[in-house]
């Protein structure tokens, strides 16, 4: 059993069928001696006296908030949230496997640039009784700050007959240098509490390995004179790492037809414009991916032929 | 990526085509080993990220954009001297930061290479000839050290007479394949953001 | 005193179907997970399917996926294996079993696919 | 498609210590616990070991477990003539959890 925040205790349970469960021994938080009771939740029944209370855990029918009395008056609480350990590995109810990248993948991260700022997100099908709480660090050992904020419903989707709902969070290392070569990773810590359940996901990784940039903007055509050919140009987007010169983009411009059958055609430039053929009906399209490290492509940028 | 290579204009900074050659090869020679020694921890994930250079060359921060020295958590400065002299200079008026940056990505590159070169001559020496060193990469490593010719001691190729362990080898090769893509990749934006200025 | 009784076994023709059952007793049934697991006569054990205590994700070997169906109603406290389309390399017996890392088997039911 | 390799038969005579070698890879022994089974002929396999050295009550105490790197062993110490059957270890793969990987199961033979 461990603290969790002040009055909540996780408990960690091997589950498994008539598995014995943990005996956990509660204290009343109080000078009184005499007197006391104890009751769980709603509950009126008494389930032992005396300032400390005795229980063998072994269910969710055992956690929740026990409560001390004396002479009608609470003195304190003790919340009791369990933990699952399934043949050795933590259970993984409340959140959905993403499988992206990988299966096993509960949390997804991502960063515009290299300022040291990223944003997590995650899934559930819970809709009501749930909170989380995130931490994260650089490193483990000698762990070095970044800062999180509050996560918040960021949205909501139907998937077949269930409703998917996604989380996210915005963190930001303490102090970040765009240009530093990362040794150790930025951990993430989620503790998500559903009901009586507790339950814990990890992320490990570098920013570099999380880059995607937001794509080019200011894209633009310029028809050139006699031709079927356009110039196709853009700009860096506002949320890149500055200089340019430095952290550089490569980009990938498409032609694509209205028919999704009909052959793109493509090409890989390091410059902010292009030549291209432009046929009738078609698009253009232009990603953006860092020019030396292959992480994300951003998402595409798109303006019709026409 | 596979994607077409431009050949740099005739006037271009000199080692920015040797640095770009330099990223593609460590890229490919890191990407085989991982297929080749997939049975070995050899992913970002399950290594250990050592840096041979750590103490001994500043290359991040002496090479740092004039526009992040104002960055506070930046300038985490190191006193280290280096020779300055070297002729990707040669058609610039330069600064000492300069000269600085260049000598530092020179002996990056010297440590690499005596260290790759120490590794490849245990690999020989495996039975399962399992997997070597690129020599693209080796001569890449030259060439880009060639450009920037720098003046400075040879460092001796290390010797060992015990009996190589080939597991911990490999191992080794892969912690300096992603340490050295890292650097790469520094080395490139460092020629770059040169040769736009 | 936990307990799994298997039934639904026999013999039936390769494209046809069964549904074999795994009835608990003796634990909170819908607080666990469930796996399906099998052994062709004179081989090994292979996994098969499993359940979460929910229902709410199903997780199958590639050998049985499209094919095999593993559910649960835990308001009966028994669970299940669905099979089409069987095949003569689906001839095995089926033992069910609880998730953890002290585990629960039913006795076995033999599933015979032949013509 | 089993991805734990066990020896197909070992032996040994009444009072003998006899193991039996489970190797698997990174992904599965390596970053999961393993268990063990003893599957007698006609019956359904019993659980001898969890969480690689662990042995559940009633269990005796000649089985023992352990695991090291990519590998597990199963060890009878003072082997007797009703150990004699087939045994099987089991772990997960990091990426198919809760798919079960078993071994391929070893015959042991008491002489």
């Known amino acids: 059993i461990w603290e969790l925040k002040k009055d909540v205790y996780v408990v960690e349970l091997d589950w498994y069928p008539d598995a014995p469960g943990e005996m956990v021994v509660l204290t009343c938080d109080t000078p009184e001696e005499d007197g006391i009771t104890w009751t769980l939740d709603q509950s009126s029944e008494v389930l032992g006296s005396g300032k400390t209370l005795t229980i063998q855990v072994k269910e969710f029918g055992d956690a929740g908030q026990y409560t001390c009395h004396k002479g009608g008056e609470v003195l304190s609480h003790s919340l009791l949230l369990l933990h699952k350990k399934e043949d050795g590995i933590w259970s993984t109810d409340i959140l959905k496997d993403q499988k992206e990248p990988k299966n096993k993948t509960f949390l997804r991260c991502e960063a515009k640039n290299y300022s040291g700022r990223f944003t997590c997100w995650w899934l559930t099908t819970i809709s009501t009784d749930l909170t989380f709480s995130v931490k994260s660090s650089r490193g483990s050992s000698d762990p070095q700050g970044v800062t999180c904020g509050a996560a918040t419903l960021s949205a909501e989707r139907v998937r077949g007959d269930n409703k998917e709902y996604e989380y996210s969070v915005e963190c930001q290392e303490d102090s970040a240098c765009p240009a530093a070569e990362e040794s150790l990773p930025i951990e993430v810590m989620v503790d998500a509490v559903h009901k009586l359940k507790y339950e814990n996901y990890t992320s490990s990784f570098f920013i570099r390995d999380i880059i995607k940039p937001d794509p080019p903007k200011n894209l633009q055509l310029k028809p050139l004179k006699n031709s079927r050919q356009v110039e196709v140009s853009w700009e860096y987007p506002d949320t890149w790492s500055t200089p340019h010169s430095y952290f550089s983009l490569t980009f990938c411009v498409q032609v694509q037809g209205k028919s999704k059958r009909e052959k793109k055609d493509r090409v890989f430039t390091d410059k902010t414009s292009a030549t291209v053929i432009c046929r009738k009906n078609a698009s253009i399209s232009v990603r953006a991916q860092d020019r030396y490290y292959s992480s994300s492509w951003s998402e595409w940028a798109s303006v019709p032929c026409s | 990526r596979n994607l077409p290579v431009a050949t740099p204009d005739p006037g271009m900074f000199p080692c920015l085509h040797h640095s770009q050659n330099l990223l593609r090869a460590v890229s490919n020679m890191l990407q085989k080993a991982r297929q080749t020694l997939e049975f070995y921890p050899c992913t970002s994930e399950e290594i250990d990220h050592e840096d041979i250079t750590k103490d001994k060359t500043s290359t991040v921060e002496a090479c740092l954009p004039l526009e992040l020295t104002k960055n506070e958590s930046c300038l985490n400065s190191r006193e280290t001297s280096f020779i300055t002299n070297g002729s990707c200079l040669a058609s610039r008026k330069t600064s000492f930061m300069m000269a600085l940056c260049l000598s530092s990505i020179y002996e990056d590159l010297k440590m690499y290479q005596v260290e790759f070169k120490t590794m490849n001559a245990k690999l020989l020496m495996d039975p399962k000839r399992q997997i070597f060193l690129d020599q693209n990469m080796l001569a890449v490593i030259d060439e880009l050290m060639q450009a920037l010719n720098f003046n400075s001691e040879t460092v001796p190729q290390k010797s060992s007479l015990e009996e190589p362990d080939f597991y911990k080898t490999k191992i080794k090769l892969c912690i300096l394949l992603h340490a050295f893509r890292i650097r790469a990749v520094t080395i490139d934006r460092v020629m770059s953001y040169l040769n736009a200025s | 005193q936990v307990q799994l009784v298997q039934s639904g076994g026999g013999v039936v023709q390769p494209g046809r179907s069964l549904r074999l059952s795994c009835a608990a007793s003796?634990?909170?049934?819908?607080?666990?997970?469930m796996h399906w697991v099998r052994q062709a006569p004179g081989k090994g054990l292979e996994w098969v399917a499993f359940i979460r205590y929910d229902g709410s994700n199903k997780y199958y070997a590639d050998s049985v996926k499209g094919r095999f169906t593993i559910s649960r109603d835990n308001s009966k406290n028994t669970l299940y294996l669905q099979m089409k389309s069987l095949r003569a390399e689906d001839t095995a017996v089926y033992y069910c079993k609880t998730h953890g890392s002290h585990d629960n088997w039913g006795q076995g039911t033999m599933v015979t696919v032949s013509s | 498609s089993y991805v734990l390799t066990q020896p197909p038969s070992v032996s040994g005579t009444p009072g003998q210590r006899v193991t039996i070698s489970c190797s698997g890879g990174r992904s599965n022994i390596g970053s999961n616990t393993v268990k063990w089974y003893q599957q007698l002929p006609g019956t359904a396999p019993k659980l001898l070991i969890y969480g690689n050295d662990q042995r559940p009550s009633g269990v005796p105490d000649r089985f023992s477990g352990s695991k090291s790197g990519t590998s597990a062993s199963l060890a009878i110490t003072g082997v007797q003539a009703e150990d004699e059957a087939d045994y099987y270890c089991?772990?997960?793969?990091?990426?198919?959890?809760?798919?079960?990987?078993f071994g391929t199961g070893t015959k042991v033979t008491v002489l």
């Open positions: 003796g634990f909170t049934f819908s607080s666990y997970g």
């Open positions: 089991q772990s997960y793969d990091r990426g198919s959890h809760p798919a079960l990987t």
